[in-house]
Amino acid sequence: LRPSRVHNSEENTMRALTLKDILNGTFSYKTFFPNWISGQEYLHQSADNNIVLYNIETGQSYTILSNRTMKSVNASNYGLSPDRQFVYLESDYSKLWRYSYTATYYIYDLSNGEFVRGNELPRPIQYLCWSPVGSKLAYVYQNNIYLKQRPGDPPFQITFNGRENKIFNGIPDWVYEEEMLPTKYALWWSPNGKFLAYAEFNDKDIPVIAYSYYGDEQYPRTINIPYPKAGAKNPVVRIFIIDTTYPAYVGPQEVPVPAMIASSDYYFSWLTWVTDERVCLQWLKRVQNVSVLSICDFREDWQTWDCPKTQEHIEESRTGWAGGFFVSRPVFSYDAISYYKIFSDKDGYKHIHYIKDTVENAIQITSGKWEAINIFRVTQDSLFYSSNEFEEYPGRRNIYRISIGSYPPSKKCVTCHLRKERCQYYTASFSDYAKYYALVCYGPGIPISTLHDGRTDQEIKILEENKELENALKNIQLPKEEIKKLEVDEITLWYKMILPPQFDRSKKYPLLIQVYGGPCSQSVRSVFAVNWISYLASKEGMVIALVDGRGTAFQGDKLLYAVYRKLGVYEVEDQITAVRKFIEMGFIDEKRIAIWGWSYGGYVSSLALASGTGLFKCGIAVAPVSSWEYYASVYTERFMGLPTKDDNLEHYKNSTVMARAEYFRNVDYLLIHGTADDNVHFQNSAQIAKALVNAQVDFQAMWYSDQNHGLSGLSTNHLYTHMTHFLKQCFSLSD
């Protein structure tokens, strides 16, 4: 037995989280994703910035590019050519939108240890990539695509019509980047580099969003972005393919759009190469409940691409929109015609299906009241996928292997019992032929990345175990977390509750609801995080709850599609229902309940505050949507249809935050937005503020000049400090 004095002093070495800890990123974790270059080799950037090649079979490592070379051009990223003769080095990174950025590229010749001189690349480049075989280069500069057979060769210009904000070749416009692809590129090499496919987006008729960027000049700049809001004119997309061996011979050939798609407004959703002479395109009607997958073949005689109707596969939803957040992508098998794909089964759960001839004859591979989430890899004898099947927790992710070589196919959970307490949420990264794979576990314990044998699933080594983080957390009083469910009127509401370290059920605590709630999202996940809400529980003694209500993902179509054409209703109702249930638990101070959210969560938190229930004392909306007429067409119409009289205009009008301005009178409301938000435009908050002023309702507001939807950098510190003060004041907590 130890004297109580000693015990107490040990207790006292434990400290609560501080806001500073969160803002400094003191407790951030690392993951390790190998950059695979073969079945048994991967590259990784070491802590001291050398580019190191690892051979798993031999255990040896090789520095292929020194930090000295990286530093000589201030490189922050690299890319090895598949023939391993060259490396591109990326510097002068300049962020544009969510994924897009421009950069300067230098090509380093590994065979002589020098940078390639002559025919250097122009700057800044919008996108650059190696061919999958050899060292051809494709790049996009000033919205046009260029091709180099070798890095030192002069470029061949593939497109000529590229024009800023008008025609985009090989890169997406704003809405395709954010809501459809979602990538920074729109070009795809065929497996052996024979062909290059690319998208052309014509934005000439799209209305432009314009906002001021204040900078520090005498006059602000105006940022103009072609941005289709709900119901507006959309980009016109075309897909072309060019032979990269003889690019000038016939030039780019357009791939035909399926007739049933081309008859009205449509989208291109993805392109998947099957072989060098077979390509698969996915198209979607503007009313996003019909998707067509079209398999096209190269006709040598005509030098064109043929997409027979017999190779068109239709995916349709009668209860909602096609797919989950996006329409899923096919994973082709070795016969180069059949494929595996995730879509809803007859019971309304997303599952893996095998399509050999028609979708109607699809063979269901997985089934159950859970969902298959991602197909990682298909080999000759195995299919690797993730799902939330294990122990019926929708917020978990485990990796499974199905043997497809034998009948009946056998299923094995690769991750379920590896580190059961620590790891319940995995993703994976596979080497060629799935010879090896890395598992990245995100929690609920401290994240860990491991390397495994693709045949036996044996763990070979730990790639990253976050030992420093583990040590740093040893003297921190972290909050307790629990994931449970509420059953309400035949709806299951999963929730995560974050409880103060010395939580006592007999006491009363202030409650903060953190909400996102957007269609096909999931907030209640078994992942590790030390963030702002961890601090609020640890230091400020709040209870924080996250609730996945109707419209959220991975629990079946009934829950997911419940919000179809009716955004802003059930998501809010379910948050309110959950709060009432939490009050019934007995440890919530019902006079001190708040709600906050960002983006879609800002919309939901605003509507919850204005619900007239009297449940919430205060709340915060960061960068909220305030009317669906202000948001992007691709996203909004997927869930709401069109804002026209003969479609769904009535609900567009009924679901605005402004329509509820009067109801904010009895709550404390903090409204926050960045003035340079390219995504959810400042217009949204400007209109809320105007409606509140017109209704003579008091509220608090903060804008962040020249900040986008992420409110990054110094704004982040200011934001969380400001929100903390607001909540502490609301909950009468001393500073």
């Epitope: 090649l53 391993r84 065979s111 002589n112």
Partner: nanobody, 123 residues
């Protein structure tokens, strides 16, 4: 087709040195990447060092700073100078060649091989 013949192996004490040579036949020797692999009993054959046609080099982390690869195009020969040898360097050393880049560490990527020469480092 390239024929390769190693020489220079033998028994040496720890901390000692050895120089391996690999003579290649063929007129286009200068355009090949050359590598030295080794295989200890019961272990995978691993790349120790490689040199590209342009003269740049690659070393396994375990030998970096101790081994040096070089080549003489006029003599169609590639060398491996091994200093500060350790008992764990004991293995059969093989010379290998490939057209294209040198930065391949897997045995399957090197089509041309010599017969090997034994290096034994005693403690």
């Amino acid at each position: 087709q390239v024929q390769l013949q190693e020489s220079g192996g033998g028994l040496v004490e720890a901390e000692g040195s050895l120089r391996l040579s690999c003579a290649a036949s063929g007129r286009t020797f200068g355009s090949y990447a050359m590598g030295w692999f080794r295989q200890a009993p019961g272990k995978e054959r691993e790349l120790v060092a490689a040199i590209s046609s342009g003269g740049s080099t690659l070393y396994a982390g375990s030998v970096k700073g101790r081994f040096t690869i070089s080549k003489d195009n006029a003599k169609n020969t590639v060398y491996l100078q091994m200093n500060s040898l350790k008992p764990e360097d004991t293995a059969v050393y093989y010379c290998a060649a490939r057209s294209g880049g040198a930065y391949y560490t897997a045995r399957v990527d090197w089509p041309y091989w010599g017969q090997g020469t034994q290096v034994t480092v005693s403690s």
